[in-house]
Interface confidence: low
């Protein structure tokens, strides 16, 4: 008789999840000499231990502590780029501006980027059929708790000027319910962080509005100011030119009309 399995509302664990995590770990540690000491089998064991045999709606940050310990990594605290709803451009940016880092440029972020995973209570099986959806099922699921944990630690590590890339095409440019709005903003340390600088990425080619005046940006400014951190905002009117200008800021087209 087939065992009854809980049906969740979200997609199941990414296929070949264990192999993917292990392969990513090996690749990352090869590329980043400062992480060569990491034992990828131990990393996988710690990752697995965080959610296997546990109810996928009852995961805690504590479950991920062994993994956090193994993945401890020092990134330059003044070179951190946060993002919200504009991951691809943020990642393209750090690929060009190699001295800046998004969470997904760290080992733990790289391991989990774009993956889904969950287990089942009291069995060692990984659930490839379905996993809890954050809204429809529960917020304390393995994926959400992982990102909350690593995002909090990443924000806590930041210092000096922290940059955040925001999507100017969305109705809520700053969304209090995003990971940035609900976790990272509240875990920047005012004694270390002087300024949060928002880069609002415009979508339309002819859009010359000052989106730094958007009500949601003003809301972000208010939250940040109350935390004794200075706030700065810049429009990026032409994202198509943005990366080119990062590569070569002295290019004449970067200091004329963009």
């Amino acid at each position: 008789v087939p065992r009854w399995r809980q049906q969740w509302s979200g997609p199941g664990t990414t296929k070949r999840f264990p192999e993917t995590v292990l392969a990513r770990c090996v690749k990352y540690t090869e590329i980043h000499p400062e992480m060569r000491h990491v034992d990828c089998q131990s990393v996988w064991d710690a990752f697995k231990g965080a959610f296997i045999s546990k109810h996928p709606c009852n995961i805690t940050e504590e479950d991920y502590q062994p993994l956090m310990k193994l993945g401890t990594q020092t990134v330059p605290c003044n070179k951190i780029l946060l993002w919200s709803r504009i991951k691809d451009l943020a990642h393209q940016f750090t690929q060009v501006q190699r001295d800046m880092f998004t969470l997904e440029d760290t080992l733990l972020g790289y391991l989990a980027d774009d993956l889904t995973w969950c287990g089942e209570f009291n069995t060692s099986k990984i659930n490839y059929q379905s996993c809890p959806d954050w809204r429809k099922d529960c917020s304390n699921n393995p994926v959400s708790v992982f990102w909350k944990t690593v995002s909090r630690r990443f924000a806590e590590a930041a210092c000096d000027v922290v940059h955040v890339m925001l999507n100017g095409s969305r109705s809520k440019i700053f969304d209090k319910n995003s990971t940035f709005g609900s976790v990272e903003v509240h875990n920047l340390q005012p004694e270390k962080v002087q300024t949060l600088e928002a880069w609002v990425i415009h979508g339309g080619r002819e859009d010359s509005r000052d989106l730094c005046q958007d009500p949601t940006i003003k809301e972000l400014e208010s939250i940040i100011s109350k935390r004794n951190i200075q706030f700065s905002c810049k429009n990026i009117y032409r994202p198509d030119k943005f990366l080119q200008c990062v590569k070569n800021p002295e290019d004449s087209s970067c200091t004329s009309e963009i």
Epitope: V161, Q194, Q230, K234, Y237, C254, T255, S256, I258
Partner: nanobody
Amino acid sequence: EVQLVESGGGLVQPGGSLRLSCAASGFTFSSNWMYWVRQAPGKGLEWVATISTDGRGTYYKDSVKGRFTVSRDNAMSTLLLQMNNLKSEDTAVYYCAKEPRVLMAYLRNLGDFGSWGQGTQVTVSS
């Protein structure tokens, strides 16, 4: 009312030096990053240098690195730009400004800043 007043410009020979000054009033100077930008005749606005609130962070356009030094006196609400080994291509009107609304690579005109001064002319010529 925010006021930024530049001074110290003039005519100087190539290789010479000038010290520009920007007197700020009407806002909390010490809480603002400050910027020097310039506009050469018939050219677009160009970022020159940036200084953080406490003066520890300084950033320069590549072509002025090692020749220009930006500094500030928060007690006097004054922004300074020491320009050494001046070249003919440094000829421009120099402005101090605050509250940029764009990345410096995207600078188009003075309206890209919340506030700016009237400018001071620097001419490098033999």
